[in-house]
């Protein structure tokens, strides 16, 4: 079975200080609901410096089908994966042989998701079996983050350089996964 | 691993409020959905409201609107849940309760140890 | 507001199976209510048994399971151990909103 993408395109942000962007449009739905006033999460402050357009934070979009076991959803879900290093624009690698921007004392900026969203999706199943009903989690937007040596590196594993590569059959998340992400299953590579 | 820790027990009056907070560690607190349920004494669970991660919002029950409210502070990953105008039938574990970070949203999977609010004249 | 509804008691055999119901006042319950099923002993906190009609967690015994049963959401003990003796609760989304049933005491006899 081939896994067919339907768009990858790249977009590249410029976050503001103390800017909270718009929820994308998947979050925008007519349920009623009772919601709480400013109910929504604060603001981040992303960046400790006053020089915030030379930051910059590449949010990677990949519309795919998502798989649980046999299961494949009835629609492709498109999902946010950030890339890249945050650092003075001017001073990011463009070309081979160009050495990275930070000092090694310096602070370490990295771009990861900032929030996350709940998207609904219908499994269909083979033989005959019931669709299944189930919420995925998929990143909604993405900020550069200042790091400190507190910050456990392995949570920022798939958040380098390396998440404009997604890697085959897992969704890139920090820290540990659980036993059913594991079983979360692309179907094929981008 | 999601872990929650609840802050100790209360005793209050009518009419008085209480705050509520639950301590999130193994992920960041915005990385995952929190709820807050409450059981009476001999009673069942009641669900009194969360994040919904499909809106991005907080929601509350019905039930509670007005007078309960649940905040996030993500710098510290806690979660607070205050209700005010107590009254006695307020009497209850209230607990946090949140999804276990995966990639497919299982709510109510991680719940911290409850929180007795006693309240009495 | 929905009301979800469960049997108040029910008592199984050691090695026995039960069936366990959670119903709507709105209607049949789907697989869009995204039904989940905990367990609760004295003194603890719930536990999840069931997410999303039919998931079962890592710690959950491979004797529950859970369905949609008669326009019902249905967790199944089969092959019943006296620690299952406890009170189990359902729970539907509606939209945003969550509802639990008033919880069902099982007891192993």
């Known amino acids: 079975q081939g896994w067919q993408a339907f768009k990858n395109d790249a977009t590249e942000i410029i976050p503001e200080l103390g800017e909270y962007p718009e929820p994308p449009p998947e979050l925008e739905n007519n349920k009623t609901m009772n919601r709480a006033e400013n109910g929504g999460r604060p603001p981040h402050h992303p960046f400790e410096t006053k020089d915030v357009s030379e930051y910059s934070c590449r949010e990677l979009h990949f519309t795919r089908y998502v798989t649980d076991g046999p299961c494949r959803s009835a629609k492709p879900v498109t999902e946010l994966v950030c890339s890249g290093q945050c650092g003075p624009a001017r001073l990011l690698p463009n070309a081979i042989g160009r050495g990275k921007w930070w000092r090694p004392s310096g602070p370490d900026f990295r771009c990861i998701p900032d929030r996350y969203r709940a998207q609904r999706v219908q499994l269909l199943c083979p033989g005959g079996e019931a669709p299944r009903a189930r919420k995925v989690r998929l990143v909604a937007s993405c900020k550069c983050k200042r790091l400190t040596r507190f910050h456990n590196q392995s949570e920022l594993k798939d958040f380098g350089t390396e998440a404009a590569r997604p890697q085959k059959g897992r969704k890139p998340r920090p820290r540990a996964r659980s036993a059913k992400a594991n079983q979360a299953e692309l179907e094929n590579a981008y | 691993e999601v872990q929650l820790v609840q802050s100790g027990a209360e005793v209050k009056k009518p009419g008085a409020s209480v705050k509520v907070s639950c301590k999130v560690s193994?992920?960041?607190?915005?990385?995952?959905?929190m709820h807050w349920v409450r059981q009476a004494p001999g009673k069942g669970l009641e669900w009194m409201g969360g994040f919904d991660p499909e809106v991005g919002e907080l929601i509350y029950a019905q039930k509670f609107q007005g007078r309960v409210t649940m905040t996030e502070d993500t710098s510290t990953d806690t979660a607070y849940m205050e209700l005010s105008s107590l009254r006695s039938e307020d009497t209850a574990v209230y607990y946090c309760?949140?999804?276990?970070?995966?990639?497919?949203?299982?709510?109510?999977?991680?719940w911290g140890p409850g929180t007795l609010v006693t309240v009495s004249s | 507001q929905a009301v979800v509804t469960q049997e108040p008691s029910l008592t199984v055999s050691p090695g026995g199976t039960v069936t366990l119901t959670c119903g709507s006042s709105t209607g049949a319950v789907t697989s869009g209510h995204y039904p989940y099923w905990f367990q609760q002993k004295p003194g603890q906190a719930p536990r999840t048994l069931i997410s999303d009609t039919n998931d079962k967690h890592s710690w959950t015994p491979a004797r529950f399971s859970g369905s949609l049963l008669g326009g019902k959401a249905a967790l199944t003990l089969s092959g019943a151990q006296p620690e299952d003796e406890a009170e189990y609760y359902c729970l539907l989304f509606y939209g945003g909103t969550v509802v639990f049933g008033g919880g069902t005491k099982l007891t192993v006899l």
């Open positions: 193994g992920y960041t607190l915005s990385e995952l959905s």
């Open positions: 309760a949140t999804d276990a970070g995966g990639f497919w949203y299982k709510f109510f999977q991680h």
